[in-house]
């Protein structure tokens, strides 16, 4: 039969494993031919059995409050036969109770605020602990409160957990206190469990301190190159108060030059000295200003602490900066007529060194083959200019200090090339004209137009004429439409393809410039074999494409 005693496991055993007891069959002679098995809820997880010996181990920490007993089943098998040696049997493992639940403060974290200098006896906060143990099980859940940390400023009532002030406190000496309260069960008897909680007690502030500058003199520097709005340094006052009571405002009390301002950084409570106007080392190299600081909020009843605002003196040194050359103008525009000879005067730029030493200036033109500049800033041409190639030049003129070639300034210079009438008008396109053999007199052969590359202040006006030779013996005539176009008309009836397959007509085109320019343009007219309706059937001529020649007179 089975051999075992009643099994008990104390709850909350901290070891990895606890030997509960041994199940064995009285048929087991120790030759290792029996195998013990454990079944049921908790087998293999909470309890294991050494299959070789029948020893039962608890491998988990047990909590009686969660489960007070385990009902398991035991089997023993003969390994050699695979048969049960004993009938499967049910057995109980009881979890024995201990005072294993310490008092717990369920509402933590605790935090309380009381005004500084509050009188003794002032109620701060009440803390309450609870104990999960059975209140009816002796004194397991009967609690007593005590103060572990916080004397002599605080006290706790042993049975209620009420914390009171027992000594006046000054926030400026210490602004918060950690009070540690212990709750013990078993009404503090031996074997009691305890729980602690921390209570953060903060002293609220009153505005009884004014801000005071850390320094009576601040020395700051500002570069003369600094733009307006630049922060040139910070000044700092300290206030023993906190929060709203320590918020402060900085201001200028004295600045004859009206050059500086002070703004308050409300996050850091610093005063930031700001440049209100640009400074110039050559004009004034140091300044002296006075600043003051006040609390932002002051209670009326505490005004006595804030009568005299703290002030400080700020000396500001202007740092000399080697400034680049300064041009008289931000940009220059010059004009010059096209076709003026090389070396012609365009204009003069001028830059000076703003620093005290007044370095001589050297000028240069960035990447220009057309213009030159000398050390006096005089710009001249290096080539004759053609407006029709470029009507504007965008130059970059650089001024460099002779004493410090790293000090450079550049400005744009725009040169406009003015027009002169140096181009004659010419055909606007290549014209290919045809006339039928059977054409009548006065038939329109071609409408022509002209272009002129010169700039026109007013509108261009072109005049069209046949050359003198063509006027005297021409088979064609021209009519000027007075709108910068003209038409070519036949001047006779009938043409002969065999005798004269091609006509070359010289057309003179003049402009309205001063002086007027004229060009001769050749119009090629092919004679075509046309049907009665006058439409072209075949145009036979030796050269299918003739380039139109023109020259300027």
């Amino acid at each position: 039969g089975w051999v075992w005693n009643q099994f008990f496991v104390p709850e909350e055993m901290n070891t990895t494993s606890h030997h509960v007891g041994r199940l064995r069959s009285d048929l087991d002679n120790g030759n290792n031919s029996f195998q013990y098995k454990l079944l049921g809820a908790g087998a293999g997880s909470t309890f294991i059995i050494d299959e070789r010996t029948g020893d039962i181990y608890a491998i988990e920490k047990l909590d009686r409050e969660e489960r007070s007993l385990y009902i398991l089943r035991a089997q023993v098998i003969d390994i050699t036969t695979g048969r049960a040696v004993e009938p499967e049997s049910e057995f109980v493992i009881k979890v024995s109770d201990i005072n294993d639940n310490e008092p717990k403060f369920l509402d933590e974290p605790y935090e309380a605020i009381v005004p500084e200098m509050s009188p003794e006896g002032t109620l701060v906060i009440q803390v309450t602990a609870s104990d999960a143990d059975d209140p009816s099980s002796g004194n397991n859940a009967r609690l007593l409160y005590s103060l572990l940390q916080g004397q002599p400023y605080f006290s706790v009532e042993p049975t209620t957990g009420v914390i009171r002030i027992s000594s006046k406190m000054d926030r400026e000496l210490q602004d918060e206190y950690w009070v540690i309260i212990q709750a013990k069960d078993m009404i503090g008897q031996p074997g009691a469990l305890s729980g602690t909680t921390s209570v953060l007690i903060k002293l609220s502030d009153v505005n009884d301190n004014k801000p005071i500058f850390k320094e009576s003199l601040y020395r700051l520097t500002v570069s003369e190159s600094a733009p307006t709005g630049t922060s040139i340094g910070t000044i700092m006052a300290y206030d023993n108060d906190i929060g709203e009571n320590a918020e402060m405002d900085y201001s200028i009390e004295e600045d004859d030059s009206q050059t500086f301002d002070i703004i308050t950084n409300h996050e850091t409570q610093e005063g930031i000295v700001i440049l209100k106007k640009k400074v110039n080392f050559e004009h004034q190299n140091h300044y002296g200003i006075r600043a003051k600081v006040k609390n932002h909020h002051v209670d009326k009843q505490l005004m006595k602490y804030h009568t005299e605002a703290s002030t400080t003196f700020i000396k500001i040194q202007v740092e000399d900066v080697d400034e680049p050359p300064l041009f008289l103008l931000p940009y220059y525009i010059f004009e010059i007529f096209e076709e003026t000879p090389q070396g012609s005067f365009v204009g003069v730029v001028s830059a000076t060194d703003p620093d005290n030493r007044k370095s001589p200036i050297r000028y240069s033109i960035t990447r220009s083959k057309v213009f030159n500049i000398d050390d006096n800033g005089t710009i001249t041409t290096t080539n004759s200019l053609d407006r029709e190639i470029s009507a504007w030049y965008n130059l970059s003129i650089t001024a460099t200090e002779k004493y410090n070639i790293e000090q450079i300034s550049s400005i744009p210079v725009y040169v406009q090339v003015l027009n002169i009438n140096d181009h004659a008008p010419e055909f606007s396109q290549y014209y290919e004209s045809y006339v039928c053999e059977n054409a009548g007199s006065g038939q329109v052969i071609q409408t022509i137009s002209a272009v002129d590359r010169d700039e026109s202040i007013e509108e261009h006006h072109f005049y069209f004429n046949l050359s003198v030779e063509d006027t005297n013996s021409s088979s064609f005539t021209i009519i000027d439409n007075q709108d910068n176009t003209a038409v070519i008309l036949t001047n006779r009836t009938g043409f002969n393809l065999q005798e004269e397959p091609i006509f070359y007509i010289s057309i003179l085109i003049a402009d309205n410039g001063i002086p007027s320019l004229t060009s001769t343009n050749t119009l090629t007219i092919h004679v075509c074999d046309c049907d009665d309706s006058g439409s072209t059937q075949t145009c036979q001529y030796q050269e299918l494409m003739l380039s139109m020649g023109f020259k300027t007179e």
Partner: antibody
Framework: QVQLVQSGAEVKKPGASVKVSCKVS????????IHWVRQAPGQGLEWMGI????????SYAQKFQGRVTMTRDTSTSTVFMELSSLRSEDTAVYYC?????????????WGQGTLVTVSS | QSALTQPPSATGTPGQRVTISCSGS????????VNWYKQLPGTAPKVLIY???QRPSGVPDRFSGSKSGTSASLAISGLQSEDESDYYC???????????FGGGTKLTVLG
């Protein structure tokens, strides 16, 4: 009955490797851990490591980490322990032992031991 | 240097009671079961006591084990000549994550 039978004695040169086998019978091979323990001449017992035959997971003593490898062959119910980079101080009797179903349960059966001599 | 400390030797006369101590630390004996092994010369060790105080079948009740804190002890009462052997304590060590043995105690039975 439960038996753990180990391979025969070995003589090895320093720097060489040795592989000792442990063939088990009389129980389900995968049900119990196998530990390896060695004993230098005239010295005490020293645990080397453990293998779980069901999962091939191993745990080695820090001292042997990197030098020892434990393997198993389920078809022959045999566990192997290989020790490499042998030195003279590895001369010892090497035992395999059966442990319980938890790491911390005692060793109830031991092999007869294998003497490994490391000598140049 | 063994993790568990045993006296290297112990002596007794037949019928006498002898105790062998084994001391360790909180990571081994302090938090795990102690086992005792007996080893006769030229043979493999055999389990004598497991789980602090449990005897396997076949081990006479003259042998008993106990544990207190970080120390354990093996007591042999009614000493007999066949008890002359080497005795080793062993336990699992949580820090080393492995088994540790004592250096062994050679028990001599006089007389």
């Amino acid at each position: 009955q439960v038996q753990l039978v180990q391979s025969g004695a070995e003589v090895k040169k320093p720097g060489a490797s040795v592989k000792v086998s442990c063939k088990v019978s009389g129980y389900t091979f995968t049900s119990y851990f196998i530990h390896w323990v060695r004993q230098a001449p005239g010295q005490g017992l020293e645990w080397m490591g453990i293998i779980n035959p069901i999962s091939v997971s191993t745990s080695y003593a820090q001292k042997f980490q990197g030098r020892v490898t434990m393997t198993r062959d389920t078809s022959t119910s045999t566990v192997f322990m290989e020790l490499s980079s042998l030195r003279s101080e590895d001369t010892a009797v090497y035992y395999c032992a059966r442990g319980g179903i938890q790491l911390w349960l005692h060793f109830d059966y031991w092999g007869q031991g294998t003497l490994v001599t490391v000598s140049s | 240097q063994s993790a568990l400390t045993q006296p290297p030797s112990a002596t007794g006369t037949p019928g006498q009671r002898v105790t062998i101590s084994c001391s360790g630390s909180s990571s081994n004996i302090g938090s795990n079961f102690v086992n005792w092994y007996k080893q006769l010369p030229g043979t493999a060790p055999k389990v004598l006591i497991y789980t602090n105080n449990q005897r396997p079948s076949g081990v006479p009740d003259r042998f008993s084990g106990s544990k207190s804190g970080t120390s354990a002890s093996l007591a042999i009462s009614g000493l007999q000549s066949e008890d002359e052997s080497d005795y080793y304590c062993a336990t699992w060590d949580d820090s080393l994550n492995g088994w540790v043995f004592g250096g062994g105690t050679k028990l001599t039975v006089l007389g």
